[in-house]
């Protein structure tokens, strides 16, 4: 499996789209900051086999997709940018799915590192809960947007390391 240069370009485009999605200045939202306890250890990539790392990356993309495709999200962001964002994420998920299948074979994929997947799911649960508590305010969405950018940049770094292993 080769996480190609095209995939890397997709990553950069995803981050750029997220940066463009900003609707409110974060300088105005400092008081709304929150520590979502990003599971960084799951993205260090040292303890993983390649297939495990890819499945964690895929979960990250899937959860990001889910978060930004809700009704509340559609109301918060520019529709055109959101559409482009979905396309980039979808492309990345397809690439990663192909990689998982290639690495371990179809049969083994469902039983991949469940603890890591669970850690990512819980991280997104904390984000969803925060948004609900803040009643999906513009500042809450800005905090989440910045947090997802940060976590996607960790994903990008992990993918770079995986490419170097190839």
């Amino acid at each position: 499996c080769n996480l190609s240069q095209t995939h890397s370009l997709n990553n950069r485009r995803t981050l750029m789209l997220m940066a463009q999605m900003r609707r409110i200045s974060p300088f105005s939202c400092l008081k709304d900051r929150h520590d979502f306890e990003f599971p960084q250890e799951e993205f260090d990539g040292n303890q993983f086999q390649k297939a495990q790392a890819i499945s964690v990356l895929h979960e990250m993309m899937q959860q990001t997709f889910n978060l930004f495709s809700t009704k509340n999200s559609s109301a918060a962001w520019d529709e055109t940018l959101l559409e482009k964002f979905y396309i980039e994420l979808f492309q990345q998920m397809n690439d990663l799915e192909a990689c998982v299948i290639q690495e371990v074979g179809v049969e083994e994929t469902p039983l991949m590192n469940e603890d890591s997947i669970l850690a990512v799911k819980k991280y997104f649960q904390r984000i969803t809960l925060y948004l609900m508590e803040k009643k999906y305010s513009p500042c809450a969405w800005e905090v989440v947007r910045a947090e997802i950018m940060r976590s996607l940049s960790f994903s990008t770094n992990l993918q770079k390391r995986l490419r170097r292993k190839d």
Partner: antibody, heavy 121, light 107 residues
Framework: QVQLVQSGAEVKKPGSSVKVSCKAS????????ISWVRQAPGQGLEWMGG????????NYAQKFQGRVTITADESTSTAYMELSSLRSEDTAVYYC??????????????WGQGTLVTVSS | DIQMTQSPSSLSASVGDRVTITCRAS??????LNWYQQKPGKAPKLLIY???SLQSGVPSRFSGSGSGTDFTLTISSLQPEDFATYYC?????????FGQGTKVEIK
């Protein structure tokens, strides 16, 4: 690596304006915040305001509202700070400072070398 | 605006001394406090962020503590290169504000 290079020293007359530039290299210019901080001779540090190039709209400290304009040119990776209606109390070293990419603009991670602006008749 | 008050405004110490600088905020700022070091003619340099996190590349003799309104910067064993002015800065809300500075001089 990250570098912020500011324009040279300026001597200005009271009532005039000054525009200081800050050219950034390293990282994606449009997606991180740049702030301007000033320091009068022998005094402490004072945040004037900040901008995120991709967002475009700047935030200003109330004290400088109406007198300061912070802008950014993505094509040249340069941020600008213009201060108008200059008075002698505006004599200071003006720093641009960069905040971390993908982070909230709360700490100043990288600094320019500073630009001395002297206001004198 | 949140006022930041540092004490002392200056202190004299010798190499090897343990030095403590305090910073008080006019209202609770949680842990949103940063510390900077500035040498004459130079730009400030970030030492500590979020009250106690050491910035990458900063020697471990520097440490920060506190939350709410009271914060401390400690230099466990003062080195010749540590003689400088130190500033605290709150990042709880805009405008971002700094303390007036503490000058650490050679005794």
């Amino acid at each position: 690596q990250v570098q912020l290079v500011q324009s040279g020293a300026e001597v200005k007359k009271p009532g005039s304006s000054v525009k200081v530039s800050c050219k950034a290299s390293g990282g994606t210019f449009s997606s991180y915040a740049i702030s301007w901080v000033r320091q009068a001779p022998g005094q402490g540090l004072e945040w004037m305001g900040g901008i995120i190039p991709i967002f475009g709209t700047a935030n200003y400290a109330q004290k400088f509202q109406g007198r300061v304009t912070i802008t950014a040119d993505e094509s040249t990776s340069t941020a600008y700070m213009e201060l108008s209606s200059l008075r002698s109390e505006d004599t200071a070293v003006y720093y641009c400072a960069r905040h971390l990419e993908y982070a909230f603009p709360d700490k100043f991670d990288y600094w320019g070398q500073g630009t001395l602006v002297t206001v004198s008749s | 605006d949140i006022q930041m008050t540092q004490s002392p405004s200056s202190l004299s110490a010798s190499v090897g001394d343990r030095v403590t600088i305090t910073c008080r905020a006019s209202q609770s700022i949680s842990s949103y406090l940063n510390w900077y070091q500035q040498k004459p003619g130079k730009a400030p340099k970030l030492l500590i962020y979020f009250a106690s996190s050491l910035q990458s590349g900063v020697p471990s003799r520097f440490s920060g503590s506190g939350s709410g309104t009271d914060f401390t910067l400690t230099i466990s064993s003062l080195q010749p290169e540590d003689f400088a002015t130190y500033y605290c800065q709150q990042s709880y809300s805009t405008p971002l504000t700094f303390g007036q500075g503490t000058k650490v001089e050679i005794k």
